[in-house]
C-alpha cells in the first residue's frame, strides 16, 4: 500500500492503489549535497549521477571505522525519497550528487560553499532545464553560506533546505535562515511536528512550510534492494524538492517566487497542532504541510500572496523591524504586531528601489514585528499614499486617487507613545472602499496598485464585546492582500494575515473592561485579478 | 534574514594604521567585519572564508590572497590558500592563524571574513 507520506502529499484525484501522478519531474535536475550515496541501489539505479565533487572533513575519532553502507546511508535515503521508483516523490527526476558530508554526516560551511560554486559553474558550462538544489544539512547561522544561497537563487536555481532538527528557531541556523531558500520543517503521520529524541523539528518565521519527516520509507544502503525508515527535516526537505521538481517539470518557466507561492498555496492549512511550538513562536510558524497541486496547470490565474514576518525589533524605544518581499514579489500591505501591545504602528517605505514594511516599537514595549503581505502581481505599479495626522475629530484618511489604482492595504503609524487610550473609536464612513481611515493622531498609509484586471474590496468583521482575536476571511476566488484593525482600539496588539484570513489580536480580555473600548473590528482587503483569470482561460 | 538574527556573533575589528603601507588601501570609513559561529563546538578556528566586495574580479581575489600570504610570511606566519572562490561569491578560503585576522581585515576589497564551521546531516 502507498506509504503514509506519499499519500499525505498527494491530492485526492491522484490517489489510487499506487502513487503515480502525471509527469514525474523528468525535465528537472535535482542536485543533492549530502553524504556519498549508493547510486546503483535498485530504487534509484540510473537516476543519480554521482559527480566527482567531494569536499568533506576527516571523520572524528581515531577508532572510526569507515563502513561503506553507513557512509552512504543518509544520501541514499534522500535520493530515494526524491526520485525513488517505489517510494519517491518525483519518480522521473534525475539527480546529481555532491559529497559534502563525511561518513559521520558532518561537513563544513566552506565545503558546502565550494559545492554550491561547483553547481553554479556546471550550470554555466552546460545550461540544462530547471535546477533544484537540495541541502539536507544545517549549521549555525552563517552570513557567507546564506549569501552564496542568495546568489545561486538569483541565478534561477531553486534551493530547498532542512529547517534543522534542534527544536529551535530555524533563523539561528544556515542555510535555513537564508530568505531565498525554501526551508522545510518536519511533521508526522498525525500532522504533528516531529520529535526526535529530546529535540525535534525547528520552527519559526524562517520556515516556509512543513512536510512529512517521520518514519519515511526509502532506499537503504545496507543492500541494493533494502529499504529503511528514517526521520528528520532532511526527509521533509526531500519531499519538497520532489514536489518542486514535479511542479517545475509541468511549468518549467516558474520563477522561485512563483514556485514558493504555489507551494504555500497548495499546502494543507492549519492541520499542525501549534501547542508543540514555544508560545512566542506559534504566530511566526507557518501552519502548512506541503502537497502536490491538484492539477499541474491552470493555477496561473490565481492571485498568490504570502505573509512574511520580520525578525523581532528588540525592546529599545526607537527599535524598528523590517519585513521584505522577494525581488519578484509586490508588497501589497504592511501590518505590525507586539505582544505587549506597545507599538507605534507601521509604514511602507522605499528602500533600495523597493517597498519594505517597517514596524516601530514604543516606549516600554518589548518589541515589535513587521508583517509584509507579499504577492505575485505581474505588471503591477504600486505606490504608497500618506496622510499626516489630521488632528480633526473624524480622524485621518487617505485614498487612492490615481485613475485605475485600487487599495490593497492600509497601515498607520504614530509618534505619540500611547495612541488615544481614552478616546472613543473612530468609525470608518461606509461606502468608501478605496479609503484608509485611521486615528487622528496617526499618519495613514494606503498601498495603491494598478495592475491589469485587478479589483479589490473591503471586508470587515466587528465584535462589540472584547475578544482576544477577531478574524475576517476573504471568500473563495479572492485573495487577502491587506489586514488591519479599525483605529481607536488601544488594546489591539496588532494584525496579521494567516493564509486568506485577517487576524486582529487584542490584549487578554480579562484585563480589559467591556466598555466600547473593547470593540474590535478586523478589516480585510480582498483582491482578485480578472486579467490573470482571462489569460489562463486563453491558454486552456 | 538580516544580521539581527539572535545568537549570531559579529566581531568588528576596526581598521588601524599599520606599518605596512598598502598600495590599495580600503575606502575611507569602511570596516570589514569578522563573523564566527555562535555555537562554540561547531567552530573550526584556523580556516577562514575571506569574502571580497561584490564586483571583485578573480584576478583581484588571487592578488589579495597572495598579498595576505606575503604579509603573513613577513610576520613569520605560514598560510595556505585552500580555494579561490568565483562564480558565486568573490573571495578565498585560507588556512591561517587567528592572529592574522586583524591584518586580513585590512586587505583591499575585503567585505567580511567568516571562520569556518561545521554543518550536519539533518
Amino acid at each position: 500500500s502507498i506509504p503514509w507520506n506519499l499519500e499525505r502529499i498527494t491530492p485526492p484525484r491522484y490517489r489510487a492503489d499506487e502513487y503515480q501522478p502525471p509527469d514525474g519531474g523528468s525535465l528537472v535536475e535535482v542536485y543533492l549535497l549530502d553524504t556519498s550515496i549508493q547510486s546503483d541501489h535498485r530504487e534509484i539505479e540510473g537516476r543519480v549521477m554521482v559527480t566527482d565533487f567531494e569536499n568533506v572533513p576527516e571523520e572524528d575519532g581515531t577508532r572510526f571505522h569507515r563502513q561503506a553502507s553507513k557512509c552512504d546511508s543518509h544520501g541514499t535515503h534522500l535520493a530515494g525519497v526524491v526520485s525513488g521508483r517505489d517510494a519517491g516523490v518525483a519518480k522521473g527526476a534525475s539527480m546529481r550528487s555532491l559529497r559534502v558530508l563525511n561518513c559521520q554526516g558532518k561537513g563544513t560551511v566552506s565545503g558546502t560553499l565550494i559545492g554550491l560554486e561547483f553547481i553554479r559553474k556546471s550550470q554555466l558550462v552546460q545550461p540544462v532545464g530547471p535546477l533544484v538544489v537540495l541541502l539536507p544539512l544545517a549549521g549555525g547561522y552563517s552570513r557567507v553560506l546564506n549569501a552564496a544561497c542568495q546568489r545561486l537563487a538569483r541565478a534561477g536555481v531553486v534551493l530547498v533546505t532542512a529547517a534543522g532538527n534542534f527544536r529551535d528557531d530555524a533563523c539561528l541556523y544556515s542555510p535555513a535562515s537564508a530568505p531565498e531558500v525554501i526551508t522545510v520543517g518536519a511533521t508526522n503521520a498525525q500532522d504533528q511536528p516531529v520529535t526526535l529524541g529530546t529535540l525535534g523539528t525547528n520552527f519559526g518565521r524562517c520556515v516556509d512550510l512543513f512536510a512529512p519527516g517521520e518514519d519515511i520509507i526509502g532506499a537503504s544502503s545496507d543492500c541494493s534492494t533494502c529499504f529503511v525508515s528514517q526521520s528528520g527535516t532532511s526527509q521533509a526537505a526531500a519531499h519538497v524538492a520532489g514536489i518542486a521538481a514535479m511542479m517545475l517539470s509541468a511549468e518549467p518557466e516558474l520563477t522561485l517566487a512563483e514556485l514558493r507561492q504555489r507551494l504555500i498555496h497548495f499546502s494543507a492549512k492549519d492541520v499542525i497542532n501549534e501547542a508543540w511550538f514555544p508560545e512566542d513562536q506559534r504566530v511566526l510558524t507557518p501552519n502548512l504541510v506541503a502537497a502536490l497541486p491538484p492539477s499541474t496547470h491552470g493555477a496561473g490565474w490565481q492571485l498568490f500572496c504570502r505573509t512574511v514576518w520580520s525578525a523581532h525589533s528588540g525592546p529599545t524605544r526607537m527599535a524598528t523591524a523590517v519585513a521584505r518581499c522577494a525581488p519578484d514579489e509586490e508588497l501589497l500591505s504592511c501590518s505590525s504586531f507586539s505582544r505587549s501591545g506597545k507599538r507605534r504602528g507601521e509604514r511602507m517605505e522605499a528602500q533600495g528601489g523597493k517597498l519594505v514594511c517597517r514596524a516601530h516599537n514604543a516606549f516600554g514595549g518589548e518589541g515589535v514585528y513587521a508583517i509584509a503581505r507579499c504577492c505575485l502581481l505581474p505588471q503591477a505599479n504600486c505606490s504608497v499614499h500618506t496622510a499626516p495626522p489630521a488632528e480633526a475629530s473624524m480622524g485621518t484618511r487617505v485614498h487612492c486617487h490615481q485613475q485605475g489604482h485600487v487599495l490593497t492595504g492600509c497601515s498607520s503609524h504614530w509618534e505619540v507613545e500611547d495612541l488615544g487610550t481614552h478616546k472613543p473609536p473612530v468609525l470608518r464612513p461606509r461606502g468608501q472602499p478605496n479609503q484608509c481611515v485611521g486615528h487622528r493622531e496617526a499618519s495613514i498609509h494606503a498601498s495603491c496598485c494598478h495592475a491589469p484586471g485587478l479589483e479589490c474590496k473591503v471586508k470587515e468583521h466587528g465584535i462589540p464585546a472584547p475578544q482576544e482575536q477577531v478574524t475576517v476571511a476573504c471568500e473563495e476566488g479572492w485573495t487577502l492582500t491587506g489586514c488591519s484593525a479599525l483605529p481607536g482600539t488601544s488594546h489591539v496588539l496588532g494584525a496579521y494575515a494567516v493564509d486568506n484570513t485577517c487576524v486582529v489580536r487584542s490584549r487578554d480580555v480579562s484585563t480589559t473592561g467591556s466598555t466600547s473600548e473593547g470593540a474590535v473590528t478586523a478589516v480585510a482587503i480582498c483582491c482578485r485579478s480578472r486579467h490573470l483569470a482571462q489569460a489562463s482561460q486563453e491558454l486552456q | 534574514q538580516e544580521d539581527e538574527d539572535g545568537d549570531y556573533e559579529e566581531l568588528v575589528l576596526a581598521l588601524r594604521s599599520e606599518e605596512d603601507g598598502l598600495a590599495e588601501a580600503p575606502e575611507h570609513g569602511t570596516t570589514a567585519t569578522f563573523h564566527r559561529c555562535a555555537k562554540d563546538p561547531w567552530r573550526l578556528p584556523g580556516t577562514y572564508v575571506v569574502v571580497l566586495k561584490e564586483e571583485t574580479h578573480l584576478s583581484q581575489s588571487e592578488r589579495t590572497a597572495r598579498r595576505l600570504q606575503a604579509q603573513a610570511a613577513r610576520r613569520g606566519y605560514l598560510t595556505k590558500i585552500l580555494h579561490v572562490f568565483h562564480g558565486l561569491l568573490p573571495g578565498f578560503l585560507v588556512k591561517m592563524s587567528g592572529d592574522l585576522l586583524e591584518l586580513a581585515l585590512k586587505l583591499p576589497h575585503v567585505d567580511y571574513i567568516e571562520e569556518d564551521s561545521s554543518v550536519f546531516a539533518q
Epitope: 503515480q20 546503483d40 535498485r42 540510473g46 549521477m49 521508483r85 541494493s224 534492494t225 | -
Partner: antibody, heavy 115, light 107 residues
Amino acid sequence: QVQLVQSGAEVKKPGASVKVSCKASGYTVTSYGISWVRQAPGQGLEWMGWVSFYNGNSNYAQKLQGRGTMTTDPSTSTAYMELRSLRSDDTAVYYCARGYSLDVWGQGTTVTVSS
Amino acid sequence: DIQMTQSPSSLSASVGDRVTITCRASQNINSWLNWYQQKPGKAPKLLIYGASSRQSGVPSRFSGSGSGTDFTLTISSLQPEDFATYYCQQWFDVPTTFGQGTKVEIK
C-alpha cells in the same frame, strides 16, 4: 553509445570452472550494477544474480548454491561471473545486463559443458 | 519467490492483427514490471518498463498497462519484424523473475 560487450564462447568439462567477462561503456558504471541472466537451449530466462560496480556487493539467486561468484573491476568497467563445479545442465547462453531493470544487454556468451 | 505466469504460451497471428499478451504476478508488484522481446540467437530487448513506459526507440504500436498483479502487453498492429518471443519480468523483489515467455508466430 551504451553497450555491454561479453567474452567469447567457452567449452568446458563437467567439474571445471568458467569465468565470463562483460565490459561496460557509454555510461557512468557506478550508477548501475550488472545482472547476470542465463538461458538454457530452448528455455526461458533465469536471473542468476547482481553485482555492484560501486562497492562490489553482490546478490545471488539461491539456485547457484555458492557455485557462483560475481565481481567487478571499476577501473576497467568490467564485470565478471565465475561458475564453478560445472554440470551439463549449466550449458546455456549467459547474458550480462545493466542493473536490475535489465535495460541494456550484452550479446551473450555460450557456455557448453560436455564431457 | 514471486511467480510470473504469462499467457498464452504461444499464439499465431497475421500482420496487422492486434495482439495481447498477459502476465500475472503471484503477489502485488506495483508497477515493477518490464516486457522484453527476444528473437532467435539474439539477446532480449527491453520494450516496456515500469509496466507502461515505452523504452526509447520502441515503436508506438507497443504499449503496456496494468499494476498490482495483472499486466498486459499490446501490439496494436502486428508487423513482420514483431514475430518473436516476449517475456515479462518483475523486479519488485529479489530474485527478479521472468514469465515463461509467449511465442508469437505467423499464422
